[in-house]
Interface confidence: medium
């Protein structure tokens, strides 16, 4: 029978900067019942507080509700493991809520094949930001990535959409069924999970593009612009 092993706070996440949750991994239990407590203080303070909610986030977690969450303060926290033989402490973790936001995936993903008479066909993808994120306040800038692949292909093609909530893709394989997904991240935070896949059948007469494409004003929502393959296939490797 031994004192407990050192726990580790391994993850903190916030869906929207208004609440956040941290999770820890217990160390060895020393063969005895072990109690865990998370204590924290805010930067510039020495007064320690105990975790306000050990339930909401599930086992080995601490949830900070709205009244305990401040974007403008940083939190310094640690976990104490105690059994009859003694105690051990995790390393401290510094948490700035701005940096740990992991939004829900974007919503309402819609995919359409557009085949204008006078121009090359293209795939039009549109989505909405996740509901928990309030973009109107200016606290958030969300960036988006799209990935797509033919149903039976192994490799995803990834496009960076910036802050746009719609995107056009021109080079696709005719006759193939494509899976399309989108995800988002705030400036300083983590990528969301990918949205559920939307399937789209590319018609057999969807012609492959020339090396450069002329996209018109209506499509771009701006001035007429010549877009190269490189621009259209802005690949990001992760």
């Amino acid at each position: 029978q031994l004192p407990p092993g050192k726990p580790e706070i391994f993850k903190c996440r916030s869906p929207n900067k208004e609440t956040f949750t941290c999770w820890w991994r217990p160390g060895t239990d020393g063969g005895l019942p072990t109690n865990y407590s998370l204590t924290y203080h805010r930067e510039g303070e020495t007064l320690m507080h105990e975790c306000p909610d050990y339930i909401t986030g599930g086992p080995n977690s601490c949830h900070f509700g709205k009244q305990y969450t401040s974007m403008w303060r940083t939190y310094i926290m640690m976990v104490n493991a105690t059994n009859q033989m003694g105690s051990s402490f995790s390393d401290e973790l510094y948490v700035d809520v701005t940096y740990i936001v992991q939004p829900d995936p974007p919503l309402e993903l819609a995919v359409e094949v557009k085949q204008p008479e006078d121009r090359k066909p293209y795939l039009w993808i549109k989505w909405s930001p996740p509901t928990l994120i309030d973009l109107k306040t200016g606290w958030f800038t969300l960036l988006y990535e799209i990935r797509l692949k033919p149903e039976k292909a192994a490799e995803w093609e990834i496009h960076f959409a910036g802050q746009q909530t719609e995107f056009k893709i021109l080079s696709l394989h005719p006759g193939q069924k494509y899976l399309v997904q989108v995800r988002c991240k705030p400036d300083h935070g983590y990528w969301s999970a990918w949205s559920p896949a939307t399937f789209i059948q590319i018609p057999s007469d969807f012609t492959m593009n020339d090396e450069q494409k002329l996209i018109s004003e209506e499509d771009l929502g701006g001035e007429q612009k010549l877009i190269s393959e490189e621009d259209l296939h802005h690949h990001h490797h992760h």
């Epitope: 706070i9 930067e43 310094i76 401290e92 700035d96 940096y99 740990i100």
Partner: antibody
Framework: EVQLLESGGGLVQPGGTLRLSCAAS????????MSWVRQAPGKGLEWVSS????????YYADSVKGRFTISRDNSKNTLFLLMNSLRAEDTAAYYC?????????????WGQGTLVTVSS | DIVMTQSPDSLTVSLGARTTINCQSS????????????LAWYQQKPGLPPKLLIY???TRESGVPDRFSGSGSGTDFTLTISSLQAEDVAIYYC?????????FGQGTKLEIN
């Protein structure tokens, strides 16, 4: 105003012992990790040792492990570095540094340093 | 051990010029638990102890002029001085505090021409 004042440096022969002290004021000493960082004449900075708020958590550079011991007396707001089996390569200015937090996360205040010279 | 490599070793720049110093770590110092890079930048003037400028790779220490900024993530970091002043002549060090032993870059000496 945060102040860190090192003392205890001087000339010592190889194999000798010195004990450095760092008197802290202007902040809640017991709430912050503390460290020793050294700088050989004309050279860069080298981290030596750190001690967290809980005095049992001590860390050492490989070059001093087994020879140097860091400790703190929170009641006297003082940090110590006991240096045994000193070598010529330990010659340096030794700085006492306050960590930004209770663990060792960046050093936001430094003392003026105390010079240790190991020479026969 | 994590090795920190700064470039250049020395730099001579005109007053008012934009200046950048680079720092590379031999392994990532970005922690997935809190999305922070465990990197600090220090300024050391002749005969004085080092002074903390930037921590968490991009957070400016209070009282540090806003012409100093830090950027980068993972293994590649930059200290930028937007408009060099005479009082910025010093040696600049980066330091990782991700893992012990905490290690410093070799320093970059900044001078004015």
């Amino acid at each position: 105003e945060v102040q860190l004042l090192e003392s205890g440096g001087g000339l010592v022969q190889p194999g000798g012992t010195l004990r450095l002290s760092c008197a802290a004021s202007g902040f809640t000493f017991s709430a912050y990790a503390m460290s020793w960082v050294r700088q050989a004449p004309g050279k860069g900075l080298e981290w030596v040792s750190s001690i967290n708020v809980r005095a049992g958590d001590t860390y050492y550079a490989d070059s001093v492990k087994g020879r140097f011991t860091i400790s703190r007396d929170n009641s006297k707001n003082t940090l110590f570095l006991l240096m045994n089996s000193l070598r010529a390569e330990d010659t340096a200015a030794y700085y006492c540094a306050k960590a930004r937090y209770s663990s060792n996360w960046g050093f936001d205040f430094w003392g003026q340093g105390t010079l240790v010279t190991v020479s026969s | 051990d994590i090795v920190m490599t700064q470039s250049p070793d020395s730099l001579t720049v005109s007053l008012g010029a934009r200046t950048t110093i680079n720092c590379q770590s031999s392994q990532t110092i970005l922690h997935s638990s809190n999305n922070h890079n465990y990197l600090a930048w220090y300024q050391q003037k002749p005969g004085l102890p080092p002074k903390l400028l930037i921590y968490w790779s991009s957070t400016r220490e209070s009282g540090v002029p806003d012409r100093f900024s830090g950027s980068g993530s993972g293994t590649d970091f930059t200290l930028t001085i937007s408009s060099l002043q005479a009082e910025d002549v010093a040696i600049y060090y980066c330091q990782q505090y991700s893992n012990t032993p905490y290690t410093f870059g070799q320093g970059t000496k900044l001078e004015i021409n």
